[in-house]
């Protein structure tokens, strides 16, 4: 599924990401835009053999199990396929664990490079939430 901007904002708010651990909703929508272009089925292979999955491009070396990433930690205790669902519950639950580590949203390279320090509220402007 490819979400609309405001549709994703509403879904993320419903799933408790607005101000989760201090990160406003705009941060999460911005991250999703530049990680996956709002596409829940996005996958991208990394040079280390791991793969990033789903709307927030969650990595298989650390967070999920795809059966093909050597030494996977699977910290979210989920199959990576769950992160490709049109239901973003699994991606959000896992993202909450990721952001609860010391690096916060810096764990997402796209957020760090494209969203951090910008007017992230623009990503939810005009949305009826």
């Amino acid at each position: 599924k490819v979400f609309g901007r405001c549709e994703l904002a509403a879904a993320m708010k419903r799933h408790g990401l607005d101000n989760y651990r201090g990160y406003s909703l705009g941060n999460w929508v911005c991250a999703a835009k530049f990680e996956s272009n709002f596409n829940t089925q996005a996958t991208n292979r990394n040079t280390d053999g791991s793969t990033d999955y789903g709307i927030l491009q969650i990595n298989s070396r650390w967070w999920c199990n795809d059966g093909r990433t050597p030494g996977s930690r699977n910290l979210c205790n989920i199959p990576c396929s769950a992160l490709l669902s049109s239901d973003i519950t699994a991606s959000v639950n896992c993202a909450k664990k990721i952001v609860s580590d010391g690096n916060g949203m810096n764990a997402w390279v796209a957020w760090r490079n494209r969203c951090k320090g910008t007017d992230v509220q623009a990503w939810i402007r005009g949305c009826r939430l």
Partner: antibody
Framework: EVQLQESGPSLVKPSQTLSLTCSVT????????WSWIRKFPGNKLEYMGY???????FYNPSLKSRISITRDTFKNQLYLQLNSVTTEDTATYYC???????WGQGTTVTVHH | DILMTQTPATLSVTPGDSVSLSCRAS??????LHWFQQKSHESPRLLIK???QSISGIPSRFSGSGSGTDFTLSINTVETEDFGMYFC?????????FGGGTKLEIK
């Protein structure tokens, strides 16, 4: 099946340091986030802090100057240290997996002269 | 810190009744609310995560609802093994905080 077991002295004197160990079996502690939570007499629960897979620690600000959570990845153990204890620190101390799925059985610590 | 308030403090029910336990947050916490059951001399047991998500191995008579500041744990047809303390906990903002608990007792 993940199992957690707390251990440590049941009696600590005021002003001393409370030191507890949580031994984890069934999973590597580097594959999770691990918490210390305590329950006071009268049923109040307090989330003391947690340590993440990367070793990052988060402490309840009410305890920040007194608390330390560490780990030994080879022994697969977590540690809680609470300095300068008072009678107000009398409680049952639990280690738990961060998601709340797994808990130790708890160990009761009394602070008393 | 976010203050979590549970009501009532004690609930007296007969097995077979259906009950609702309330938890209120002092500010919005989205769906970042979890419910635990604790029986005497036992560790807490996770019943519901993220306000309404079920937990493997927990009987289907337990369900959760709510978002923002008001949450409810419902037990559809209470069984004798359900008596004990129930706590809510928020994980939206650090430090995470618990409610004061509701004691579910036999009438």
């Amino acid at each position: 099946e993940v199992q957690l077991q707390e251990s440590g002295p049941s009696l600590v004197k005021p002003s001393q340091t409370l030191s507890l160990t949580c031994s984890v079996t069934g999973d590597s502690i580097t594959r999770g986030y691990w918490s210390w939570i305590r329950k006071f007499p009268g049923n109040k629960l307090e989330y003391m802090g947690y340590i993440s897979y990367s070793g990052s620690t988060f402490y309840n600000p009410s305890l920040k100057s007194r608390i330390s959570i560490t780990r030994d990845t080879f022994k697969n153990q977590l540690y809680l240290q609470l300095n300068s204890v008072t009678t107000e620190d009398t409680a049952t101390y639990y280690c738990a997996e961060y998601d709340g799925t797994y808990w130790g059985q708890g160990t009761t610590v009394t602070v008393h002269h | 810190d976010i203050l979590m308030t549970q009501t009532p403090a004690t609930l007296s029910v007969t097995p077979g009744d259906s009950v609702s336990l309330s938890c209120r947050a002092s500010q919005s916490i989205g769906n970042n609310l979890h419910w635990f059951q604790q029986k005497s001399h036992e560790s807490p047991r996770l019943l519901i995560k993220y306000a309404s998500q079920s937990i493997s191995g927990i009987p289907s008579r337990f369900s959760g609802s709510g978002s923002g500041t008001d949450f409810t744990l419902s037990i559809n047809t209470v069984e004798t093994e359900d008596f004990g303390m129930y706590f809510c906990q928020q994980s939206n903002s650090w430090p995470y905080t618990f409610g004061g608990g509701t004691k579910l007792e036999i009438k």
